[in-house]
């Protein structure tokens, strides 16, 4: 089955290369196991940025080397992506899968355009 996933249209990363946004899904049932995947589309290519499976009421657990962190509250997931540079500017898409109990539901957001501006280096002081 399909479900609606909402996310902001645009986010500007901080000067430290951190971007946060909320991914909200309209759960048609009482899911206990949810999988959230962040995709990036740029230059006609889609890649997986990070993914986490979590039990409702528990924290999201990404892999240790992941650039993503997140928390969940009800049907909302607060995602943070760090270590971003200007070359990472692109459309970041939230994909939500309700894994358990059946039936399986899948929803994909319209994407959040994340703009990353590399900070200017500090000028040398005399």
């Amino acid at each position: 089955k399909a479900m609606h996933v909402a996310q902001p249209a645009v986010v500007l990363a901080s000067s430290r290369g951190i971007a946060s946004f909320v991914c909200e899904y309209a759960s048609p049932g009482k899911a206990t196991e949810v999988r959230v995947t962040v995709l990036r589309q740029a230059d006609s290519q889609v890649t997986e940025v990070c993914a986490a499976t979590y039990m409702m009421g528990n924290e999201l657990t990404f892999l240790d080397d992941s650039i993503c962190t997140g928390t969940s509250s009800g049907n909302q997931v607060n995602l943070t992506i760090q270590g971003l540079r200007a070359m990472d500017t692109g459309l970041y898409i939230c994909k939500v899968e309700l894994m358990y109990p059946p039936p399986y539901y899948l929803g994909i957001g319209n994407g959040t355009q994340i703009y990353v501006i590399d900070p200017e280096p500090c000028p040398d002081s005399d």
Partner: nanobody, 130 residues
Framework: EVQLVESGGGLVQPGGSLRLSCAAS????????LGWFRQAPGKGREAVST???????SYADSVKGRFTISRDNAKNTLYLQMNSLRPEDTAVYYC????????????????????????WGQGTLVTVSS
């Protein structure tokens, strides 16, 4: 439970034709994007063609003018008519549903577009050989 079942694959000579079908059950998918993908031996899955709920179609450059996608919403069935088949068309062909139509038209030109789809069938093997 959603089920997608492909059929129509087989062995065909170069220049021949095949018509693939994908029957869906447990899902009212007329408002979403439907797609055909293929995976050749030792290669990744690639989008071949997509069709929107309004009937707009898109094709990978490699199949344009040879393949035609269509859908019958009343029968919950997706089709792929394949003409002028070439040895490089040999692959397992899958149908899939994309829940967000925003990514429908661009999928065949996008590497990794399979991320936008779900509810995959088991696939049907197409072999083009003399």
């Amino acid at each position: 439970e959603v089920q997608l079942v492909e059929s129509g694959g087989g062995l065909v000579q170069p220049g021949g034709s095949l018509r693939l079908s994908c029957a869906a059950s447990g899902y009212t998918y007329s408002r979403h994007c439907l797609g055909w993908f293929r995976q050749a031996p030792g290669k990744g899955r690639e989008a071949v063609s997509t069709i929107s709920s309004g009937g707009s179609t898109s094709y990978a450059d490699s199949v344009k003018g040879r393949f035609t996608i269509s859908r019958d919403n009343a029968k919950n069935t997706l089709y792929l008519q394949m003409n002028s088949l070439r040895p490089e068309d040999t692959a397992v062909y899958y149908c899939a549903i994309g829940p967000n139509p925003r990514y429908c038209s661009g999928a065949p030109a996008t590497r990794g577009a399979e991320h936008y789809f779900g509810y995959w069938g088991q696939g049907t093997l197409v072999t083009v050989s003399s």
